[in-house]
């Protein structure tokens, strides 16, 4: 029995619903009474959802899963996972048995976009060329961990004197704080780019220092 799942991970945004696709080819005369369908977490073996002997056995996963009962007889064993959380990320095994059996694992990749970065400057007044300033770029509630890039007004990457920290909150979402220490020129723009590697989403923030006053676009 061939069980088919997508090769690529299913990407789902936190808080949305995701469908983990799984299908099999039923034989002629197939009856749901003969079907055993089990969704389990691949690594821990935790039961997620099951269908046995013609009956949906229900969700064993925080009551956030559902099958597509009207489609089972056509070989659609997909699982709907509601209100996706960071903790749901991982591999799910779809196992089907009728006369024969088969299984396949599908990966769920959870993602959340990062907020537009806020920029802070320290010190933030009486700045002169040659002063060393600390520019902090903060972006919130993204997943997975971000990639952070700094550049100057000419697009030249700034890699030295950058310290980036990422801390997960209770939901597993990351807050990113990246600090650039730079010696001021006569004027200049400093940009920070926070990239979500899964969504390929970039969030930009910049600060322009033009003597007095500074602007934060």
């Amino acid at each position: 029995l061939e069980v088919q799942v997508p090769e690529d991970p299913v990407v789902a945004l936190v808080g949305t619903d995701a469908t983990l696709c799984c299908s099999f080819s039923p034989e002629p005369g197939f009856s749901l009474a003969q079907l055993n369908l089990i969704w389990q977490l691949t690594d821990t073996k935790q039961l997620v959802h099951s269908f046995a002997e013609g009956q949906d056995q229900g969700s064993a996963y925080a009551n956030r899963t559902a099958l597509f009962p009207d489609l089972l007889a056509q070989g659609n064993a997909s699982l709907r996972l509601q209100r996706v959380r960071v903790a749901d990320e991982g591999s799910f095994t779809c196992f089907v048995s009728i006369r024969d059996f088969g299984s396949a694992a599908v990966s769920l990749q959870v993602a959340a976009p990062y907020s537009k970065p806020s920029m802070t400057l320290e010190p933030n007044k009486d700045l002169r060329p040659g002063d060393t300033v600390t520019i902090t770029c903060s972006s919130y509630r993204g997943y997975p961990e971000a990639e952070v890039f700094w550049q100057d007004g000419q697009g030249v990457p700034l890699t030295g004197n950058v310290t980036t920290s990422q801390m997960a909150n209770e939901q597993g979402l990351f807050d990113v704080h990246s600090v650039l220490r730079v010696v001021l020129g006569a004027n200049g723009t400093y940009s920070c780019l926070v990239r979500n590697p899964v969504l390929q989403q970039d969030a930009h923030g910049s600060v322009t220092i033009t003597g007095q006053p500074m602007t934060f676009p």
């Epitope: 055993n36 389990q40 073996k45 039961l47 099951s50 002997e53 048995s97 006369r99 024969d100 088969g102």
Partner: antibody, heavy 120, light 110 residues
Framework: EVQLLESGGGLVQPGGSLRLSCAAS????????MTWVRQAPGKGLEWVAD????????LYADAVKGRFTISRDNSKNIVYLQMNSLRGEDTAVYYC?????????????WGQGTTVTVSS | QSVLTQPPSASGTPGQRVTISCSGV????????VHWYQQLPGTAPKLLIY???ERPSGVPDRFSGSTSGTSASLAISGLQSEDEADYYC???????????FGGGTKLTVL
Amino acid sequence: EVQLLESGGGLVQPGGSLRLSCAASGFTFSSYPMTWVRQAPGKGLEWVADINSGGGTTLYADAVKGRFTISRDNSKNIVYLQMNSLRGEDTAVYYCAKHLDYYSYGMDVWGQGTTVTVSS
Amino acid sequence: QSVLTQPPSASGTPGQRVTISCSGVTSKIGSKYVHWYQQLPGTAPKLLIYRNFERPSGVPDRFSGSTSGTSASLAISGLQSEDEADYYCATWEGALNGWVFGGGTKLTVL
């Protein structure tokens, strides 16, 4: 007559390897999942591994996962159990079994078993 | 993973009815079916009951199976000396747990 005949058992040192074979006859071998079950001396039955009809999906008991490999050759009507990194606790009689028409209905035909002894 | 619990031993006299229990059949992971195997001394196991109560061809109707709640039972009526054997219950526990057997019950015909 439906028959299963195991072979390949014997005495092997800890850490060694052994390959068991189970030759099937009397039924359409390529249509049925197959199972290996073992029984340690004086103990009960313990499931070891399953393989589906085409050989594309395999299942293993935690105790043997990563050490044992179940495979089949549908052209020869044989199912194999490759056992590596053998331990004392693998000492048992190993049975192969054929499933009923529906996989979850159990195993209806069993071989006579082959004895594996792991000892130094 | 569930554990199927059987009494280690049971006994009866010829002609009697004996029952062997198998508890712990609570899983929603796989099939809810319980199967029973008979293993005569020195021989391979033989399927006695499948899908809780069905008998394969060739198995006498003296053997019957039933389920109730989280327990399954094998009943043997009109006990005969050739019924002296080990009896195992089994169920299927899903893709990642496989087949689970009870510890076995040794039936002695007195």
